[in-house]
């Protein structure tokens, strides 16, 4: 069945049941996600605007899918398996009486079950499993996933230590001078350099030692966290930001309307689901898109891919690859490639690495 092909997943609570305080709803949903993040490499982040991977909805009767709710009792909730659009979304029947305790229907316990579906789990035949199809109240203070639940979710995503580069469980700001720090995306924006990581970005103003950390949502509330690639076309005052199979256009530091759009509008084949890194070279007026161990070259004037691509990164960028995390263009002759906690200054005229640095070397660490 389907799974999320990433470990950083956003959710949004679309609306709130009047049965509970908003804070109690937020807490129940957060704790329910935490149940699954505790046993997997997955990390969940709540967003308040924009498109989340998982939308949490309280609704009654017919509510915008093929599966109308049935009034009090019976079907309590349903959730869609991972995917775009409605994929991953969890719907709770507003005709139930949602509670924080054993009376009515416990929101936390129901949400744990539904989020299991949102992550790709089916029902379990083990009556002790939270993924067993029928609702049964258990003490939420001592609640634990069954061995069957853990086996199921870890068969899809692995165990928690399988991805050390994920954001901190509490989503706190990563330590800037951590020698293992890596970045999701890096780009110039005028005379500044933006370094993206999880839901944060650092701003480095050229030649100044001081850097500042910011939430992506504080600058661009409609953008998601976990930006995966970015590039700038300075002459047009444009910045392109990528996440999964979508991209956003920022003009003069303002998000353009009618975005996100599909990365496939650039001409990528269907199998490309995300961009690892991107960089625009104003000398050639070409953008290089890095995907796994390959790269594409896009003609920004003709708005189409150059023929003969993709090519292997290792074949054409000596010493770089096979995969990269981020890249940006600087000083009219260098690409700065980021791979994990390492960074390579690459002279594209000489076509070789001229310096090896730590990824956070820009911050005076």
């Amino acid at each position: 069945g389907p799974v999320w092909r990433k470990h950083y997943i956003t959710y949004r609570i679309n609306n709130y049941t009047p049965d509970m305080n908003r804070e109690d709803v937020d807490y129940a949903i957060r704790k329910a996600f935490q149940v699954w993040s505790n046993v997997t490499p997955l990390k969940f982040s709540k967003i308040n605007t924009g498109m989340a991977d998982i939308l949490v909805v309280f609704a009654r009767g017919a509510h915008g899918d093929f599966h109308a709710f049935d009034g009090k009792g019976g079907i309590l909730a349903h959730a869609f398996g991972p995917g775009s659009g409605i994929g991953g979304d969890a719907h709770f029947d507003e005709d139930e009486f949602w509670t924080t305790h054993s009376g009515g229907t416990n929101l936390f316990l129901t949400a744990v079950h539904e989020i299991g579906h949102s992550l790709g789990l089916g029902h379990s035949s083990d009556p002790k499993a939270v993924m067993f199809p029928t609702y049964k109240y258990v003490d939420i203070n001592t609640f634990r996933l069954s061995a069957d639940d853990i086996r199921g979710i870890q068969s899809l995503y692995g165990d928690p230590k399988e991805n050390q580069r994920l954001p901190n469980p509490d989503n706190s700001e990563p330590a800037l001078c951590d020698p293992n720090l890596s970045f999701d995306a890096v780009t110039t924006v005028g005379n500044k350099i933006f370094f993206f990581k999880d839901r944060f970005f650092w701003l480095k103003v050229s030649e100044r030692p001081k850097t500042s950390v910011n939430l992506i949502s504080s600058l661009w509330p409609t953008l998601p966290s976990g930006i995966e690639a970015a590039y700038e076309i300075e002459a047009r005052n444009q910045v392109f930001l990528f996440k999964d199979d979508k991209y956003w256009l920022i003009s003069n530091l303002r998000p353009e309307p009618n975005y996100p759009k599909s990365i496939h509008s650039f001409g990528f084949p269907n199998f490309v689901k995300k961009i690892d890194a991107a960089v625009f070279n104003p000398r050639f007026y070409r953008t290089y898109f890095f995907v796994d161990n390959q790269y594409w070259r896009y003609d920004e004037r003709r708005q189409m891919m150059d023929p003969g691509y993709p090519k292997l990164i290792t074949k054409n960028f000596q010493g770089i690859g096979p995969k990269i995390d981020a890249v940006f263009y600087s000083k009219n002759k260098y690409y700065y490639f980021f791979q994990g906690s390492n960074q390579f200054e690459y002279d594209f005229l000489l076509q070789r690495i001229t310096k090896t640095l730590k990824s956070n070397s820009w911050f005076g660490c």
Epitope: G1, P2, F66, F80, I86, P260
Partner: antibody, heavy 122, light 103 residues
Framework: EVQLLESGGGLVQPGGSLRLSCAAS????????MHWVRQAPGKGLEWVSG????????IYADSVKGRFTISRDNSKNTLYLQMNSLRAEDTAVYYC???????????????WGRGTLVTVSS | DIQMTQSPSSLSASVGDRVTITCRAN??????LNWYQQKPGKAPELLIY???SLQSGVPSRFSGSGSGTDFTLTISSLQPEDFATYYC?????FGQGTKLEIK
């Protein structure tokens, strides 16, 4: 490449029966919800019926409930629509359409067949 | 029951024009709205899903927006091949269609 090919359409008298088939290829048929959507001549699109990947859950538009039966044979990669007690207003091109996989239908039809024409007339 | 109202039912425009088609639901459908294009004698093709996501292979001149009850499909610069009928859809309910014709 995903392909859906409908067959079984034709001319039938009111009250008669017809069975439509949709042969699927280019994807793992047994993972996906499948649907029938119809279009009367010169009119808009009307959803008819859907079936879960396993075949265990079926859903119908009110206009066909009790008369039409959707089914599938995953071993043959084929979707069916058994149409009984046909009426003149059932005259339409019938399309089969692919949905996403999962226990619930997304209502997102990403691939469609070319359609087969059913004419109900005396 | 949920109903979808699409407008206009027909529209005349010229190549290069910017065109907007709207779809309204009688209750919130969140972002669960899709747009399809259908050319005469052909099957419908998915253009936009989840209100604003462009289906793979669809040109970027097509865009969708909206959430809740009000949705729009925009074609930023009409091309000759865009003259067709457009449908909004949410689960088992389709809008009545908008026929886009050459002026």
């Amino acid at each position: 490449e995903v392909q859906l090919l409908e067959s079984g359409g034709g001319l039938v008298q009111p009250g008669g029966s017809l069975r439509l088939s949709c042969a699927a290829s280019g994807f793992t048929f047994s993972w996906y919800w499948m649907h029938w959507v119809r279009q009367a001549p010169g009119k808009g699109l009307e959803w008819v019926s859907g079936i879960v990947s396993s075949g265990g859950t079926t859903i119908y538009a009110d206009s066909v409930k009790g008369r039409f039966t959707i089914s599938r044979d995953n071993s043959k990669n084929t979707l069916y629509l058994q149409m009984n007690s046909l009426r003149a207003e059932d005259t339409a091109v019938y399309y089969c359409a692919k949905d996403i996989r999962g226990p619930y239908s997304s209502g997102l039809f990403d691939y469609w067949g070319r359609g087969t024409l059913v004419t109900v007339s005396s | 029951d949920i109903q979808m109202t699409q407008s206009p039912s027909s529209l005349s425009a010229s190549v290069g024009d910017r065109v907007t088609i709207t779809c309204r639901a009688n209750q919130s459908i969140y972002t669960y709205l899709n747009w399809y294009q259908q050319k005469p004698g052909k099957a419908p093709e998915l253009l936009i899903y989840a209100a604003s996501s462009l289906q793979s292979g669809v040109p970027s001149r097509f865009s969708g927006s909206g959430s809740g009850t009000d949705f729009t499909l925009t074609i930023s610069s009409l091309q000759p091949e865009d003259f067709a009928t457009y449908y909004c859809q949410q689960a088992g309910i389709f809008g009545q269609g908008t026929k886009l014709e050459i002026k």
